[in-house]
Structures are given as structure tokens and as C-alpha cells.
């Protein structure tokens, strides 16, 4: 089964590269997950996204879990997911009516 993910090899300052031009087809039977890295710098938030093997992504996310403190300067959060384009933008919260 082939999965699609967003990919931006280089960090994109304050651009989470979740638009169609960043969509790639992952390697069949090897890259079964999408990965995302979010780094919070004084200059802004930086992103890195790509396909990954589950082993590679889980090694990384587990090894760097202690560096993840969302909203704090120098926080780095690694996430792995296994549905198509799951490393895209966060779903917008609906306002309560």
C-alpha cells in the first residue's frame, strides 16, 4: 500500500508546507508513515516533513520526546502518523455556536 505525505526537506520559516505542491508519494512497502518536525525558534516556527519508515519515525519521536514543549522557545516536537497526508495542517477548530 502506498501512502502520500507532505514533504519539505528544508525548514520553511512560518510556512508549514501543507499545500498541494509539497505532496509526495512514499516508497511502497518501506515508507509507511508521514513524519513532521516542528521547531520553535526566536525567529519563528520551522517545519520539516516527509515520508518515513515506521521504525525511523518512532526511533526519532521516542528519542526526542523530552525536547517537545509546545509554545516554548527551542521546543522540538516530532510526530509520526500513518494515514494519507496526516502530516499536513492541523484541523481548524470550529467555533462554538
Amino acid at each position: 500500500l502506498q501512502i502520500q505525505c507532505y514533504q519539505c526537506e528544508e525548514f520553511q520559516l512560518n510556512n508549514d508546507c501543507s499545500s498541494p505542491e509539497f505532496i509526495v508519494n512514499c516508497t511502497v512497502n518501506v515508507q509507511d508513515m508521514c513524519q513532521k518536525e516542528v521547531m520553535e525558534q526566536s525567529a519563528g516556527i520551522m517545519y520539516r516533513k516527509s515520508c518515513a519508515s515506521s521504525a525511523a519515525c518512532l526511533i526519532a519521536s521516542a528519542g526526542y520526546q523530552s525536547f517537545c514543549s509546545p509554545g516554548k522557545l527551542n521546543s522540538v516536537c516530532i510526530s509520526c502518523c500513518n494515514t494519507p497526508l496526516c502530516n499536513g495542517p492541523r484541523p481548524k477548530k470550529r467555533g462554538s455556536s
Epitope: T27, E37, M39, A43, M46, S50, I59, G63, N74
Partner: antibody, heavy 120, light 107 residues
């Protein structure tokens, strides 16, 4: 035990080609990026390029772009550096090293290096 | 490309001295900086990752600090085996450039 072993270095004439190998043991290269770094005699470290073996995605330093090609054979757990159109300034010890794709990760294991001499 | 500038390029020190090496990035690299030690004829060895985290097996006399653009490697009490060349490297952005190195020599 994690180990990286380079081979394939030697003396080559300007304009010639050489292929270096980086054989990994103790870990699976598909879970890491494999980087090549070189060091000219008496000089500092210079990053050459890297490959993510699970996808084959490569990136190169400007100084070698178009002349060097990095590849990997995951079945052999080995990465390669194909060097073409070699110049005198490519003379260096070439190291391979592994690194997780995470930006905070560093090159935690290095090979012993292999010397490439480009001279007529 | 982002440059990593180390200073000094060399220094002379005695056993027991406190040694400080600095590294400056030409733009914000958060804490994505590593430090390596290299001895003649040997491959570099990782000392510090993520600016301040001591790598496994590295003696506690080595420490790193900094974030953004300014980083420091400190050896609290120089030992005979510490005479070597030290390199900083940024691990965020491609290419992951190294500093030019600092050679620590015996006074």
C-alpha cells in the same frame, strides 16, 4: 555494536573516478541518514552530502554537485559515494557518519575514514 | 548558507585549566548545534548534541551552552587526553556546516 567501515580510497588521476563504500553494522541504515564528510590534509571538516536510504533522497554540497553521487543498497546495509571528474582539491580523508533526520540529532557514529588522493 | 564561525582558531592551555571555545551562527539555529572532538589521524567523536546535552560516555568536564546564534563549549578542567581539535556543527538546515575548528595545544 554500531560500526561504519569505509573502503575504496586510493590514488587516482585528475578527471578520474572512484567509488567509496560505507558498510554499516549494528543498525539498519533505512532508519538513519548517512552523511559523507571529508577532510583535506591539515584542514577542517567539510560536509559532502547525505542520503536517506529509505527513500533514496540525496543532497549535496555545492562543491561536489554534479560530480559526486550518493546511493545506498539497503539489502547490503551499505552506502556509496561515486566520485567522478575528480580534482586535486578533492584529495581528502572521506568519512561516512550516521544521523537521525531530527534537526537536534548529531552524527553520533563515524567510520575510520578512507584516503582519496587525486594526483598525476 | 548559514556560516558557523569558531573562535579562537587555536589556543594553548595547561592541564587543569578551564577552556572555553565559542561558535557563532550567522542566523538563528535554535539549539541545533553539536560539538565534536578530533585527534590526529582519527575520526571525529561526538561530545555534545542539541547545544547542551552530553553524549553518552563523554566525561562530565565537557559542557555546552547557548541557543539562537551564540554557543559555547567548555572544558572545566583540561586533561592530557583533551588536547585535540574541536568543531561545532549546526544540524538544522542543509548543508549542515561545520565551524573551522579550534586546536587546543599544550602550553
Amino acid at each position: 555494536e554500531v560500526q561504519l567501515v569505509e573502503s575504496g580510497g586510493g590514488l587516482v588521476q585528475p578527471g578520474g573516478s572512484l567509488r567509496l563504500s560505507c558498510a554499516a553494522s549494528g543498525f539498519t541504515i533505512t532508519n538513519y541518514g548517512i552523511h559523507w564528510v571529508r577532510q583535506a590534509p591539515g584542514k577542517g571538516l567539510e560536509w559532502v552530502g547525505r542520503i536517506y536510504p529509505d527513500s533514496g533522497a540525496t543532497y549535496y554540497a555545492d562543491s561536489v554537485k554534479g560530480r559526486f553521487t550518493i546511493s545506498a543498497d539497503t539489502s547490503k546495509n551499505t552506502a556509496y559515494l561515486q566520485m567522478n571528474s575528480l580534482r586535486a582539491e578533492d584529495t581528502a580523508v572521506y568519512y561516512c557518519a550516521r544521523k537521525l533526520w531530527v534537526s537536534l540529532a548529531a552524527m553520533d557514529y563515524w567510520g575510520q575514514g578512507t584516503l582519496v588522493t587525486v594526483s598525476s | 548558507d548559514i556560516q558557523m564561525t569558531q573562535s579562537p582558531s587555536s589556543l594553548s592551555a595547561s592541564v587543569g585549566d578551564r577552556v572555553t571555545i565559542t561558535c557563532r551562527a550567522s542566523q538563528d539555529v535554535s539549539t541545533a548545534v553539536a560539538w565534536y572532538q578530533q585527534k590526529p589521524g582519527k575520526a571525529p567523536k561526538l561530545l555534545i548534541y542539541s547545544a547542551s546535552f552530553l553524549y553518552s560516555g563523554v566525561p562530565s568536564r565537557f559542557s555546552g551552552s547557548g541557543s539562537g546564534t551564540d554557543f559555547t563549549l567548555t572544558i572545566s578542567s583540561l586533561q592530557p587526553e583533551d588536547f585535540a581539535t574541536y568543531y561545532c556543527q549546526r544540524s538544522v538546515f542543509t548543508p549542515p556546516a561545520f565551524g573551522q575548528g579550534t586546536k587546543v595545544e599544550i602550553k
